[in-house]
């Protein structure tokens, strides 16, 4: 009879050590939750703050209304310019108007001084009809100056404060642009 | 990695139309552009058209007005719709994916614009 109590007695003994395992494990899960959700809440906060933060344009670019744009560093010919843009989902400098073409040179002469820089003008080769990149027409005030008499593809670039034309194959540097990036406030 | 799969290549007479689709899969978060590239034999490999994340559109001046680019971001997928096609555009038309760092290119779909 003593034997059994004694084993019944082992049992509840082994049962208790059971759940105070099950109850530490608990304990521990519980916390690690909470750590996790504190981390959690944590990145959330740090995410939104730098989102709130993140300027409208990338560094070495420059903003003006909702457009950033970028003066490059390297001469290219104006197809590869073009490409040089698109690898950072940008585009050539599309002039919309007077007053961006004013801000453009204006930054340009604080920046660089006097040189070429290639925009995304061409000319249609069957039509002689200047386009921009995406297919608009520039407004009547910003067309390029006769300059060019070349017979191969004719493309548009900015020095000064002039829009002027030019071989789409000599080197000259770029300017590209995309949108900025709007604040959600 | 990002993968590129042309369709809608074929034979066209000039002045005729055709479209072209790209899909895309991968890590399309990398990609800056999506672009429409073209190649005839022993010339080099030359934009067409393109299109950024930011949806801003640039064209070849030889194709300016004729072609139009588009994208279905739900799809991830690019077309390039293809008007008064003439002999000269004759080419393998090549998807790309462009990022600071690299392209991604598809395999090539062949167009051919002949009477």
């Known amino acids: 009879k003593l034997l059994q109590v004694s084993t019944i007695a082992m049992q509840q003994q082994e049962k208790l050590i059971q759940q105070e395992r099950a109850l530490l494990n608990f304990t521990e899960w519980k916390r690690s939750c909470a750590l996790q959700m504190k981390y959690c809440q944590a990145f959330m906060q740090n995410s939104l703050s730098s989102a709130h933060n993140s300027s409208p344009c990338p560094n070495n670019w420059i903003q003006n209304r909702e457009s950033c744009y970028y003066v490059s560093e390297i001469w290219s010919i104006w197809h590869t310019s073009q490409e040089n843009c698109l690898k950072e989902g940008s585009t050539l400098l599309q002039i919309e108007s007077k007053e961006e073409m004013d801000f453009i040179t204006g930054s340009l002469r604080k920046i660089k001084g006097s040189y070429d820089y290639w925009v995304g003008l061409s000319q249609d080769g069957h039509s002689g009809r200047w386009l921009w990149q995406d297919g608009s027409s520039p407004s009547p005030g910003l067309l390029p100056a006769e300059r060019s008499q070349s017979a191969n593809q004719v493309c548009g670039y900015v020095k000064s404060n002039s829009l002027l034309s030019s071989n789409c194959s000599t080197w000259k540097y770029f300017i590209c642009e995309k949108y900025a990036l709007r604040s959600s406030v | 990695q990002v993968q590129l799969q042309e369709s809608g290549g074929g034979l066209v007479q000039p002045g005729g139309f055709l479209s072209l689709s790209c899909a895309a899969s991968?890590?399309?978060?990398?990609?800056?552009?999506m672009a429409w590239y073209r190649q005839v034999p022993g010339k080099q490999r030359e934009l067409v058209a393109a299109?950024?994340?930011?949806?801003?559109?640039a064209y070849a001046p030889s194709v300016n007005g004729r072609f139009t680019i588009s994208r279905d971001y739900a799809k991830n997928t690019i077309h390039l719709q293809m008007n008064s096609l003439e002999p000269e555009d004759t080419a393998v038309y090549y998807c790309?994916?462009?990022?600071?760092?690299?392209?991604?290119w598809g395999q090539g779909t062949q167009v051919t614009v002949s009477s």
């Open positions: 991968g890590s399309m978060h990398s990609v800056n552009s």
């Open positions: 299109i950024t994340s930011g949806g801003r559109l």
């Open positions: 790309a994916a462009l990022n600071s760092a690299t392209t991604y």
